[in-house]
């Protein structure tokens, strides 16, 4: 088996529908071409549940799975599904084997599928297989985001990867939520990052021949505190007919725990405003953001008295925000008439 020889299944003929799960060991750097179904009606190839695109280094195209040069991250489970159905035509796992340098011409051409078949091969210190994926060194992300660091590498023997944080072995045991180490993907994933995750993350890739390392710098930015933000245009001016139901909506965004009130502007002694200059209001609904449907004000079976100005008031430890809308209630007998309502407003 030459190092350049392709790993290839049977030609692209009509497949047996009784495909058994197969395991193929592929040498690093070796091209791969696997077929599934007839070329014109070939199945779709998936890797780990994701459909392969028809272009790229690893591609699924006209029933073929083609890998230009097999890399460690190409290892994994591949499925070929018949077009327009979920029938599995191929179910196989590709395993990274040692790269080959020499062999006998009369060797069994399928011998590479047997992991126990050993070959002499040159030892090679670890090297980065996708340095372009590692160019971003400085990472500044908002608290709560997910961070993924990757150090795709290869070598002979296949290297191992370890992660350090600020120079110390890192397993995530002291981290709330832990970490995900995906050795097959040479990756470290941290979800919901917090300020204590700041620091230097080093991937250390080693084999018997040598080692390489790469540093990622992570900064976690705390969200700047602000008063609640209300979605523009909500609540919206609404026109309803007497006897109908109305919903007013208010969308609130706040990092700090917000408190929401629905207010109706009222008139007292012929005046809308008190001596202090503030409007007279009636509190209709009050709750925290996590209360059920607090952001919606329901008005059932509205009457003419329900017409007027309604305000969504949201506050947190930093400040208050509010936006208002007008409800116009029309008599039942004249539903075509509409009143011009003032614009909803947002005040600092």
């Amino acid at each position: 088996l030459e190092a350049s020889e392709e790993v290839e299944l049977e030609p692209c003929l009509a497949p047996s529908l009784e495909q058994q799960e197969q395991e193929l060991t592929v040498a690093l750097g070796q091209p791969v071409r696997l077929c599934c179904g007839r070329a014109e009606r070939g199945g779709h190839w998936y890797k780990e549940g994701s459909r392969l695109a028809p272009a790229g280094r690893v591609r699924g195209w006209r029933g073929r799975l083609e890998i230009a040069s097999f890399l460690p991250e190409d290892a994994g489970r591949y499925l070929c599904l018949a077009r327009g159905s979920m029938i599995v035509l191929q179910n196989l796992t590709l395993i990274t084997g040692d790269s080959l340098t020499s062999s006998n011409d009369d060797e069994d051409p399928k011998s590479h599928r047997d992991p126990s078949n050993r070959h002499s091969y040159p030892q090679q210190a670890p090297y980065w297989t996708h340095p372009q994926r590692m160019e971003k060194k400085l990472h500044a992300v908002p608290a709560g985001n997910t961070v993924k660091f990757r150090c795709p590498a290869a070598g002979n023997p296949t290297p191992t990867i370890r992660w350090l944080k600020d120079g110390q072995a890192f397993h995530g045991e002291n981290r709330i939520g832990g970490i995900r180490l995906r050795h097959q993907h040479w990756s470290l994933v941290m979800e919901s990052v917090v300020p204590s995750d700041r620091g230097t993350y080093t991937c250390l890739v080693e084999n018997a021949v040598g080692s390489i390392r790469y540093n990622y710098l992570l900064d976690v930015l705390e969200r700047s505190p602000h008063r609640p933000i209300l979605q523009a245009g909500l609540p919206a001016n609404t026109t309803a007919v007497v006897g109908s139901d109305v919903e007013l909506l208010c969308k609130v965004y706040s990092d700090a725990q917000p408190h929401i009130q629905w207010l109706k502007h009222i008139v007292i002694n012929g005046s809308s405003f008190g001596a202090d200059g503030f409007p007279y209001v009636q509190v209709l609904k009050t709750a925290d953001i996590n209360s059920s449907e607090v952001e919606v004000l329901y008005l059932r079976n509205v009457s003419a008295e329900d017409a007027g100005e309604y305000t969504c008031l949201a506050g947190n430890s930093i400040g208050l925000s509010y936006q208002s809308a007008w409800l116009t209630v029309l008599p039942e007998e004249d539903p075509t008439w509409t009143a011009a309502a003032p614009e909803a407003r947002y005040t600092d």
């Epitope: 160019e135 971003k136 060194k137 700041r198 620091g199 080093t202 390489i212 540093n215 930015l221």
Partner: antibody
Framework: EVQLLESGGGLVQPGGSLRLSCAAS????????MSWVRQAPGKGLEWVSL????????YYADSVQGRFTISRDNSKNTLYLQMNSLRAEDTAVYYC????????????WGQGTLVTVSS | QSVLTQPPSASGTPGQRVTISCSGS????????VNWYQQLPGTAPKLLIY???QRPSGVPDRFSGSKSGTSASLAISGLRSEDEADYYC?????????????FGGGTKLTVL
């Protein structure tokens, strides 16, 4: 206008201290890593120190480790370099520089401030 | 002694092509991208080439960069008198001590 403006340089005796400042304007200072780079008279560039946008992580060249402290005040858009136990070999023009997001190269430099350590 | 090695000087006549080399190791150039800075006499350095071969806006296409293995180079074609300056290569270094930025010693370019 996007710019960095250093200040605080001057003449100081060996063993003395000095604090350099770098005022940033025209960009979101708090989300950028920032560095100090120095250049001794007639010599090449030497990276001195780096600080993350939050100020939570700092990094130093071996030559200044334990003597210099980098810090920042994001509310004032200002970067600092506190230099203690100064030596004659610290004499240089000190530049403050912005590390571009992600890749970390220096895409914006200040005009520099001269620090002279001499008795 | 700089971590990255550059020739101390280079020269050329107007219109000529000049190349400046920068040599490093697996922990810096071998693992990271290379950036080049131009420092005109009496001024602060300026970014010239980033990520091995990218030019910031405003930098003429006469300047180009490349990287191979643990070495990089800066090429200047159609040399002009205003190109007379010091040129520095730089890269991150993933040393045992943590991340550092390392520079070359600089190359003084003279336009004859």
């Amino acid at each position: 206008e996007v710019q960095l403006l250093e200040s605080g340089g001057g003449l100081v005796q060996p063993g003395g201290s000095l604090r350099l400042s770098c005022a940033a304007s025209g960009f979101t200072f708090s989300s950028n890593y920032m560095s100090w780079v120095r250049q001794a008279p007639g010599k090449g560039l030497e990276w001195v120190s780096l600080i993350s946008g939050s100020g939570g992580s700092t990094y130093y060249a071996d030559s200044v480790q334990g003597r210099f402290t980098i810090s920042r005040d994001n509310s004032k858009n200002t970067l600092y370099l506190q230099m203690n136990s100064l030596r004659a070999e610290d004499t240089a023009v000190y530049y403050c520089a912005r590390n571009t997001a992600g890749f970390g190269y220096f895409d914006l430099w200040g005009q520099g401030t001269l620090v002279t350590v001499s008795s | 002694q700089s971590v990255l090695t550059q020739p101390p000087s280079a020269s050329g006549t107007p219109g000529q092509r000049v190349t400046i080399s920068c040599s490093g190791s697996s922990s810096n150039i071998g693992s990271n991208t290379v950036n080049w800075y131009q420092q005109l006499p009496g001024t602060a350095p300026k970014l010239l080439i980033y990520r091995n071969n990218q030019r910031p806006s405003g930098v003429p296409d006469r300047f180009s960069g490349s990287k191979s293995g643990t070495s990089a180079s800066l090429a200047i074609s159609g040399l002009r008198s205003e190109d007379e300056a010091d040129y520095y290569c730089a890269a991150w270094d993933d040393s045992l001590n943590g991340p550092l930025v390392v520079f070359g010693g600089g190359t003084k370019l003279t336009v004859l």
